[in-house]
């Protein structure tokens, strides 16, 4: 049925889906706080621009009776149920914030006549790529894939003189929502990553992973996995690792690596950690004291979703344009807006761009150091530490295939 949008005559409402099944186990109270903070800032920004309008949020809660797994497994129907609730109440805002689960976002996008923008903190999977009215404010799998291909091909850095074309991917099915979709994208036979690699095998059992570490007949020296250092330790323990093994640990939403007093454990010496830059600038190879540990990416994405809506509302109101139009619904992309922690850039498809950081463990200091950064917006790698104190021979990353000469 056609649902009227509460989105005109100086009153603009945001519908916030508060789903029991969520990409991250963040208390709903934290998400509410984030949304309310965003509203206070948006109201201030609009007032400063001379726009005397009302902006509010309506929180739509799931009853939690049926869809109570707490993770994303039963989110498909929960999302549609919430939309039905909105429809029955005949109350839809100018914009929909949430859901965060790939399953629910994909299904909601598929099953609704979306003439309004959808902003998601999550929806990491490839199935949510290239959706015309969907904006994603946490790095989706496609961005990770593009970094990996770019890094694999790189062969002109002092510390990486070989192109790589092979990889193992460890994926045991117990991953968090973000990791599940990141690894799913790497596993998919039709993905860009698979297309660009000559050899790729998915390791699904702990024993498979453990055996590869010292297997002389392994087909690749590179293993990609997703999670934190503790996850790796549980799997690897203190087992011996062949000297030319490189583990790429994808841990985007974890900034513990940037804390002042963190020392890298010994089992991390063969590991390169891929994470997100915690600040707007991270140019020197040893971390500045001005970087704070703030594990809050999920709630922050909700907050930035509110600020993004405020940004677009301001532009359309200043131009005298209608908000309840397809033009507005399709406008949440190819732009930069002032987010809570600084400027936020969205690409042509409404996906957030960011600076990814590849870290290594210094054998001298036992600290995490920045090896390189990668700008997802321009798909470009920027080396930071030209002479890293690696564990690998000659302070260079090894070839991906043992015994193969320069490529």
């Amino acid at each position: 049925s056609q649902v009227s949008q509460n989105c005109h005559n100086g009153s603009y409402e945001i519908s916030v889906l508060m789903m029991g099944n969520s990409a991250f186990a963040e208390p709903l109270k934290n998400l509410e706080d984030a949304v309310n903070e965003g509203l206070e800032i948006v109201r201030g920004r609009l007032q400063n621009a001379g726009l005397n309008v009302t902006v509010n949020a309506t929180f739509m809660y799931s009853d939690g009776l049926i869809h109570n797994s707490g993770d994303c497994r039963s989110s498909t129907c929960e999302g549609l149920d919430l939309l039905r609730k909105i429809s029955n109440a005949q109350r839809m805002g100018c914009v929909l914030i949430g859901p965060s689960c790939t399953y629910s976002t994909f299904q909601m996008y598929l099953d609704t006549e979306l003439s309004y923008p959808m902003i998601s903190a999550g929806s990491f999977g490839l199935s949510c790529d290239y959706k015309e009215t969907l904006t994603r404010l946490m790095s989706p799998a496609r961005k990770l894939m593009y970094f990996l291909v770019n890094f694999w091909k790189t062969n002109d850095l002092p510390f990486k003189t070989y192109s790589w074309s092979t990889s193992y991917v460890y994926k045991n099915g117990t991953e968090t929502e973000d990791c599940f979709w990141y690894l799913n994208a790497l596993e998919a036979s039709v993905s860009y990553f698979s297309h660009e690699l000559g050899f790729k095998v998915v390791l699904r059992q702990d024993k498979e992973f453990q055996d590869i570490l010292m297997d002389h007949n392994r087909k690749s020296n590179v293993i990609i996995m997703c999670g934190g250092p503790e996850f790796l330790y549980k799997l690897k323990g203190d087992r011996a690792v062949a000297e030319d093994i490189v583990i790429i640990l994808v841990d985007l939403f974890n900034d513990q690596y940037f804390e002042d007093n963190v020392t890298a454990p010994d089992y991390m010496k063969n590991v390169l950690v891929l994470t997100l830059s915690p600040g707007n600038s991270l140019l020197n190879s040893s971390f500045s004291r001005n970087l704070s540990p703030t594990k809050r990416d999920f709630a922050l994405a909700y907050l930035n979703g509110i600020l993004l809506f405020g940004h677009m509302l301001k532009i359309f109101l200043e131009n005298g344009e209608n908000i309840t139009t397809p033009k507005f619904a399709h406008a949440f992309r190819n732009l930069t807006f002032e987010g809570y922690d600084g400027p936020v850039t969205l690409d042509d498809w409404g996906d957030v761009d960011s600076t990814m950081v590849l870290l290594y463990t210094s054998v001298d200091t036992k600290k995490y150091k920045v090896l390189l950064t990668y700008d997802t917006h321009v798909n470009k790698t920027y080396p930071v530490d030209m002479s890293p104190t690696f564990t690998w021979k000659n302070s260079k990353l090894p070839n991906d295939i043992t015994g193969r000469g320069p490529q």
């Epitope: 706080d33 984030a34 903070e37 800032i41 201030g44 704070s292």
Partner: nanobody, 115 residues
Framework: EVQLVESGGGLVQPGGSLRLSCAAS????????MTWVRQAPGKGLEWVAK????????YYADSVKGRFTISRDNAKNSLYLQMNSLRAEDTAVYYC????????WGQGTLVTVSS
């Protein structure tokens, strides 16, 4: 350990001024939005003013707009609230808080506006 310590409160006559300070420690002050919040006797919490990490944006509740000014000095890890033209209804305990979820609070400083 994160600490926020407010000071500068006291008894002032209507129409008078006060300057509140908040000394922050235990975290990188320059990376956080900060907010002044107040609680009047027998009332709920009300946000008063907020300021971006670099001081580039400042917002005020309608009830204090034009009378109060929020500022910060990142070099000194300090937050300030200049309160002018004080009214009886500004009587409250004033707290400084950190970030969107206001995860850390000080002990507060009492401002009493009375003749």
């Amino acid at each position: 350990e994160v600490q926020l310590v407010e000071s500068g409160g006291g008894l002032v006559q209507p129409g008078g001024s006060l300057r509140l300070s908040c000394a922050a420690s235990g975290f990188t002050f320059s990376r956080y939005w900060m907010t002044w919040v107040r609680q009047a006797p027998g009332k709920g919490l009300e946000w008063v003013a907020k300021i971006r990490h670099d001081g580039g944006e400042k917002y005020y509740a309608d009830s204090v707009k034009g009378r109060f000014t929020i500022s910060r000095d990142n070099a000194k890890n300090s937050l300030y609230l200049q309160m002018n033209s004080l009214r009886a209804e500004d009587t409250a305990v004033y707290y400084c808080t950190r970030d969107y979820n206001k995860d850390y609070w000080g002990q507060g400083t009492l401002v009493t506006v009375s003749s």
